[in-house]
Interface confidence: low
């Protein structure tokens, strides 16, 4: 046996050469350098600028790459889904030396990470995914995708995150590899759009008049612009924006005794408008009086009969039906009469008399306007 | 730019009325709740009066209600405070204000105007 | 009415200073609150509203945090420019303004 030295050179993080000396007992068998770095993994560095990439070779020694230029591991001005051969060697291994296929891959630049979540959709979920905007000739069987958003991995083109928080931020990492290497990653933050707001509590809703009603509520919890009103009266429905500050609203001009539906909702005008939840309620408004009835007929149907008849008033405005007919000769009233319908037959009245027939509607709660006729009885023909 | 300027403090003994006016320009005026507010010299700032972007609501506080009217002119894009029966507390800078569309607050204020209620 | 109550209504602090204001309201207010700055001789200006949202073209080194009854106003990094009244105001039933908080400089 006798003694062999060998010298290793390597760099240290300050970048300046330490040399150690290694005294061994037998004849070194040092490795294959296709053994040693059999299996060496690769990151891919892009020039924005020269649109050309580096190959950075992930090894400890400064190795030597045969006819291509290598410094500091790096192999440079590499371009963009072209191969390129590597021979690397080094003073630690013998031949045969490591034959390194670079596989380049895709310029950076023709990838985008695209926000694809939809606005209708922007406060509950978050869409992600790359979108290749030039074409590349590397194979794209080759490429692979990841996602990582909180401790969720995803290894998909395309991410979509759902039952998110409203007005939330998110964070999502993500990187593409070409042949299992990375070559680019981005981040992004999103924050979740405003969420719907909540429903409005109503504190009374109530009608206290013929013509009004009023509504009180306490504003929903989460972010809204304004409120939207709506009062729906048999098939007619209105609706009103109200400002964010109310918290009351008096409604005027309603019809009397009319049944309202009430419906109020919050809304938020965000990505796209959101309603929230609406809150109902109901009133009856009080009676009032009721219209004229019209088109009163008085005729004749003997010397002293008369029938008189009358279209229903147009707005009743009470609860109940009913006809009255007065008949007055001079001052003093001498028939008094009250129908279900406006149909009444007046007999038994003085011949050659002018009379007064007043017809109007009762709704139970109040008359309404008389509709007023004069007519005469004629001189007995018998 | 979103611009108010205010107009209209003077010097006056007290029971007697002034109005004041507010200009608005850079905006939409008639999308916008307005509103008053004054601040003793020195001191805090205190609201009265606000209306809304029609003027169908109106809000004061007990301090100036039945004594003040805040009112608008949308197609002048003017706001106005009648003051009446003034006291010597009404005596402040008065400034208007633009109420922010997304909050209750005021997102624009005016430089003021100085109201004095003396004898 | 509600009432506000702000504290402290005086304060001293050094440039680069953490520094917050507190406002209590006297009862929940819902996070209808916004904070606003004034300097001396000029009208206030809003620098927060809703509790935590950041008004435009109002530096980051001011938030605002809190629910209920209880706000407050935190300025990260105390900066020369800072020197101000700050006041408080709730806005969930009429106005209500706090007393202030009148900042100036070690």
């Known amino acids: 046996a006798y003694l062999n030295a060998s010298e290793t050179t390597t760099l240290s993080p300050s970048g300046s050469a330490v040399i150690s000396t290694t005294t061994i007992a037998t004849t070194p068998s040092k490795p294959t350098c296709d053994e040693k770095y059999a299996n060496i993994t690769v990151d891919y560095l892009y020039n924005k600028e020269t649109k050309l990439f580096t190959a950075k070779l992930n090894v400890n020694e400064n190795v030597e790459c045969g006819n291509n230029t290598c410094t500091n591991n790096e192999v440079h001005n590499l371009t963009e889904c072209k191969n390129a051969s590597v021979s690397i060697s080094h003073n630690s291994c013998t031949a045969p030396d490591k034959t390194l296929i670079l596989d380049v891959p895709p310029g950076v630049e023709k990838f985008q990470l695209h926000d694809c979540t939809q606005v209708e959709k922007a406060d509950t979920t978050i869409c992600l995914k790359w979108k290749n905007i030039e074409t590349f000739t590397c194979d794209t069987q080759n490429i692979t995708y990841r996602f990582q958003c909180g401790n969720m991995i995803f290894d998909n083109k395309e991410i979509k995150l759902e039952n998110l928080e409203p007005e939330h931020e998110y964070k999502c990492d993500s990187e593409i590899l070409y042949n299992n290497h990375k070559f680019t990653n981005a981040s992004k933050i999103i924050k979740t759009d405003f969420g719907s707001p909540g429903e409005p509590q109503i504190i009374f809703c109530r009608s206290e008049a013929a013509h009004q009603g009023v509504i009180t509520w306490n504003p929903p919890q989460r972010s809204f612009h304004n409120f939207t009103l709506c009062y729906i009266k048999e098939t007619e429905k209105d609706c009103l924006n109200l400002d964010k500050n109310l918290i009351k609203y008096d409604l005027q001009n309603l019809k009397p005794y009319t049944k309202y539906v009430l419906s109020l909702h919050a809304y938020i005008i965000a990505k796209v408008q959101r309603n929230g939840s609406a809150a109902m309620c109901h009133f009856t408004t009080k009676s009032a009086p009721p219209s004229q009835v019209w088109n009163m007929t008085v005729s004749m149907t003997s010397d002293n009969s008369m029938h008189v008849k009358c279209r229903p008033p147009r707005d009743r405005n009470g609860p109940h039906e009913r006809y009255h007919l007065e008949v007055e000769a001079g001052n003093t009233l001498v028939r008094n009469e009250s129908h279900k319908n406006c149909d009444f037959r007046v007999k038994d009245l003085q011949y050659s008399t002018d009379y007064t027939f007043k017809a109007y509607f009762h709704n139970g709660d109040y008359p309404g306007e008389p509709f007023i006729l004069h007519h005469s009885t004629s001189y007995n023909s018998k | 730019e979103v611009q108010l300027v205010e107009s209209g403090g003077d010097l006056v003994q007290p029971g007697r009325s002034l109005k004041l006016s507010c200009v608005a320009s850079?905006?939409?005026?008639?999308?916008?709740?307005m509103t008053w507010i004054r601040q003793v010299p020195g001191k805090g700032l205190e609201w009265v009066a606000s209306?809304?972007?029609?003027?169908?609501?109106?809000y004061y506080p007990d301090s100036v209600k039945d004594r003040f009217t805040i009112s608008r002119d949308n197609a002048k894009n003017t706001l106005f405070l009648q003051m009446n029966s003034l006291r010597s507390e009404d005596t402040a800078t008065y400034y208007c204000?633009?109420?922010?569309?997304?909050?209750?607050?005021?997102?624009?204020w005016g430089q003021g105007t100085s109201v004095t209620v003396s004898s | 009415d509600i009432q506000m109550t702000q504290s402290p209504s005086f304060l001293s602090a050094s440039v680069g200073d953490r520094v917050t204001i507190i406002c209590k309201a006297s009862?929940?207010?819902?996070?209808?609150l916004d904070w606003y700055q004034q300097k001396l001789g000029e009208a206030p200006k809003l620098l927060i509203y809703?509790?935590?949202n950041l008004h435009t073209g109002i530096p980051s080194r001011f938030s605002g945090s809190g629910s209920g009854t209880d706000y407050t106003l935190t300025i990260s990094s105390l900066q020369p420019e800072d020197v101000a009244t700050y006041f408080c105001?709730?806005?969930?039933?009429?106005?209500?303004f706090g007393g202030g908080t009148k900042l100036e400089l070690k």
């Open positions: 209306i809304s972007s029609s003027g169908g609501s109106i």
């Open positions: 105001l709730q806005h969930i039933s009429r106005w209500t």
């Open positions: 850079g905006f939409t005026f008639n999308n916008y709740w």
């Open positions: 809703n509790t935590n």
């Open positions: 009862q929940d207010i819902n996070k209808y």
């Open positions: 204000a633009r109420l922010y569309y997304y909050s209750g607050g005021g997102d624009a």
